[in-house]
């Protein structure tokens, strides 16, 4: 039975040209995290394999930085980056957990930043 839950940063906004940390945290399970995939709709941004480290999709390699932790830092944001992002936790023996983050990239320089997510 899958008992875990994914906590995410939820809905966040950031300024065009700035950067943002996408962060998820899996809790309430003792399952072993084998891999975390970061995806946007039908696109793969990055994979963090617990043993093999990071794979960054070439289309994002100049704008994505691994971390902190299992999170992902998106840089040089454009309005086209607005949309849904998914963290997909592959775990053993539970299976797959998915978290959702909605990012809005604003033209305005007075964009409200969502509270930075801290893993305890």
């Amino acid at each position: 039975m899958m008992t875990g839950t994914i906590e995410t940063t939820g809905n966040i906004s950031a300024e065009k040209g700035g950067s943002i940390i996408l962060q998820c945290h899996l809790s309430s399970t003792t399952a072993q995290v084998t891999q975390v995939n970061w995806e946007q709709q039908d696109q793969l941004l990055a994979i963090c394999n617990a043993d093999l480290g990071w794979h960054i999709s070439p289309s994002f390699k100049d704008r994505v930085a691994p971390g902190p932790g299992l999170g992902l830092t998106l840089q040089s944001l454009t309005v086209n980056d607005t949309g849904e992002y998914f963290c997909i936790y592959h775990t053993y023996p539970d299976g797959t957990y998915t978290g959702r983050i909605f990012l809005e990239v604003l033209e305005s320089s007075v964009a409200e930043h969502g509270a930075r997510f801290q893993i305890p």
């Epitope: 084998t34 480290g53 960054i56 999709s57 070439p58 289309s59 691994p66």
Partner: antibody
Framework: EVQLVQSGAEVKKPGASVKISCKTS????????MHWVRQAPGKGLEWIGG????????SYNQKFKGRATLTVDKSTSTAYMELSSLRSEDTAVYYC????????????WGQGTLVTVSS | DIQLTQSPSSLSASVGDRVTITCKAS??????VAWYQQKPGKAPKLLIY???YRNTGVPSRFSGSGSGTDFTFTISSLQPEDFATYYC?????????FGQGTKLEIK
């Protein structure tokens, strides 16, 4: 120039073990994952596992877990793959292959080591 | 494990022909697919990574496309040195798996 040079062909008896080396040069060894792939005669490619030298992280294909052991010697920039309890079906060419930078595909390959298991 | 099915398994073609090989994954792998060329007695050589990116030094006649479960590898105009076996590989999740290969032969 990136190079991966593997040890020579081996003939082993069933039940024995074999240890293949893969000496690398031309790049910073600890920054790239090393994969091991095998190919039985006339057959396709099969991923055995991969190792990240900087932190020692190892991912094994479950099929080989318990029989395959991946190690590295950072001082000589050499990767090793040991396979134990050999059987005839393990007769194959074994390749080491470097994972591309921040990617899981393999951009440089060793020349291969033929392991023959025969009684 | 994710299964990759290549088609056709073998293919006869002539120099100058346009050749297409397909690779179907048993589940969504996004764009985490690579294509390799292997000649007899030699190690595989990376041609395409992340579904559509040509590796350094690979001629422009080689291309790849696709996303999700369906991928295509194309040689726009076959050259004599292109006769070999081609493999797709997924690196979306471990164990990384390969297709069974497509042997490209001279007609």
């Amino acid at each position: 120039e990136v190079q991966l040079v593997q040890s020579g062909a081996e003939v082993k008896k069933p039940g024995a073990s074999v240890k293949i080396s893969c000496k690398t040069s031309g790049y910073t060894f600890t920054e790239f994952t090393m994969h091991w792939v095998r190919q039985a005669p006339g057959k396709g490619l099969e991923w055995i596992g991969g190792l990240k030298p900087d932190n020692g992280g190892i991912s094994y294909n479950q099929k080989f877990k318990g029989r395959a052991t991946l190690t590295v010697d950072k001082s000589t920039s050499t990767a090793y793959m040991e396979l134990s309890s050999l059987r005839s079906e393990d007769t194959a060419v074994y390749y080491c292959a470097r994972g591309a930078y921040y990617r899981y595909d393999a951009d440089y390959w060793g020349q291969g080591t033929l392991v023959t298991v025969s009684s | 494990d994710i299964q990759l099915t290549q088609s056709p398994s073998s293919l006869s073609a002539s120099v100058g022909d346009r050749v297409t090989i397909t690779c179907k994954a048993s589940q969504d792998v996004k764009t985490a697919v690579a294509w390799y060329q292997q000649k007899p007695g030699k190690a595989p050589k990376l041609l395409i990574y992340s579904a559509s990116y040509r590796n350094t030094g690979v001629p422009s006649r080689f291309s790849g496309s696709g996303s999700g479960t369906d991928f295509t590898f194309t040689i726009s105009s076959l050259q004599p040195e292109d006769f070999a076996t081609y493999y797709c590989q997924q690196h979306y999740s471990t164990p990384f798996t390969f297709g069974q290969g497509t042997k490209l032969e001279i007609k």
